[in-house]
């Protein structure tokens, strides 16, 4: 009955503070409405990074002010988180909810450890 969610164990953000990873879920049923949430877990505290609800076959749309973007293809969601800094290094969990039709299913990934390294400032060139 449980829905399995797979995501990579580790991802290194780019020098521009962008990290991308795939969140894949094994849908027990034929969902038409799916909610994807990215959560950050630090010191056992969990906070929401971003969330989007989409209809199967349609594009994934995050809020305009979201730091996340994404695309969906079948049971796979390609997530990109932007504007990351070294202090944002942590475990990012992909949560998937099959909202419709019934029954509802919840899937929680094991999390992706995202490492963010702030770029060294360019040396002044005289």
């Amino acid at each position: 009955k449980a829905m399995h969610v797979a995501q990579p164990a580790v991802v290194l953000a780019s020098s521009r503070g962008i990290a991308s990873f795939v969140c894949e879920y094994a849908s027990p049923g034929k969902a038409t409405e799916v909610r994807v949430t990215v959560l950050r877990q630090a010191d056992s505290q969990v906070t929401e990074v971003c969330a989007a609800t989409y209809m199967m076959g349609n594009e994934l749309t995050f809020l305009d002010d979201s730091i996340c973007t994404g695309t969906s293809s079948g049971n796979q969601v390609n997530l990109t988180i932007q504007g990351l800094r070294a202090m944002d290094t942590g475990l990012y969990i992909c949560k998937v909810e099959l909202m419709y039709p019934p029954p509802y299913y919840l899937g929680i990934g094991n999390g992706t450890q995202i490492y963010v390294i702030d770029p060294e400032p360019c040396p002044d060139s005289d």
Epitope: K1, A2, M3, E33, R35, L39, E48, M99, L106, I108
Partner: antibody, heavy 118, light 108 residues
Framework: QVQLVESGGGVVQPGRSLRLSCAAS????????MHWVRQAPGKGLEWVTF????????YYADSVKGRFTISRDNSKNTLTLEMNGLRPEDTAIYYC???????????WGQGTLVTVSS | EIVLTQSPGTLSLSPGERATLSCRAS???????LAWYQQKPGQAPRLLIY???SRATGIPDRFSGSGSGTDFTLTISRLEPEDFAVYYC?????????FGQGTKVEIK
């Protein structure tokens, strides 16, 4: 701090209606799914109904399907349970509960008692 | 529907003793989707354990959860006077959300 406060309970005759409310505060209400759970006197916990973030998706226990309606007003941070065709077996304390980020019910209200009796 | 069966129905123990509560599911429940709650008379339930073994905020480390598949356990390593209560397991991986019938931990 997170607070859930139920109201609207009372004594009602079989077949009549009652409307329960749950006022939420201390968190971004629209970011959480919500539930109603009930507990008959001296009995265990029974899940009653669920509502999604935007209120578009609702699920009900078979025992209340077609009689109870859950709704939410995200602008007023309020969860509502409309109960019609009440039966003596609906007598219980009704709790509203918030779904935590990882799925369990992390915060509960203090409950409101509904007694269905003639 | 996933049916959860808790045992024993009542556990009579003394403060300082170890309590072991069992929850068995009628079908496999992912360990990420199993919670334990504590309820004292006249109070709302309180989340203790989620994801089968993660303690909720503010829960003392004498409470621990374990198990996977269909068999789950809540252990209270040394019972304190405030631990005597009713404990419920719950699955939240799919609808309908279901609870076990509860285990009462009473003072012997």
């Amino acid at each position: 701090q997170v607070q859930l406060v139920e109201s609207g309970g009372g004594v009602v005759q079989p077949g009549r209606s009652l409307r329960l409310s749950c006022a939420a505060s201390g968190f971004t209400f629209s970011s959480y799914t919500m539930h109603w759970v009930r507990q008959a006197p001296g009995k265990g916990l029974e899940w009653v109904t669920f509502i999604s973030y935007d209120g578009n998706n609702k699920y009900y226990a078979d025992s209340v399907k077609g009689r109870f309606t859950i709704s939410r007003d995200n602008s007023k941070n309020t969860l509502t349970l409309e109960m019609n065709g009440l039966r003596p077996e609906d007598t219980a304390i009704y709790y509203c509960a918030r779904t935590g980020w990882l799925g369990p019910f992390d915060y509960w209200g203090q409950g409101t008692l509904v007694t269905v009796s003639s | 529907e996933i049916v959860l069966t808790q045992s024993p129905g009542t556990l009579s123990l003394s403060p300082g003793e170890r309590a072991t509560l069992s929850c068995r599911a009628s079908q496999s429940v992912g360990s990420s989707y199993l919670a334990w709650y504590q309820q004292k008379p006249g109070q709302a339930p309180r989340l203790l354990i989620y994801g089968a073994f993660s303690r909720a905020t503010g829960i003392p480390d004498r409470f621990s959860g374990s198990g996977s598949g269909t068999d789950f356990t809540l252990t209270i390593s040394r019972l304190e006077p405030e631990d005597f209560a009713v404990y419920y397991c719950q699955q939240y991986g799919s609808s309908p959300w279901t609870f076990g019938q509860g285990t009462k931990v009473e003072i012997k």
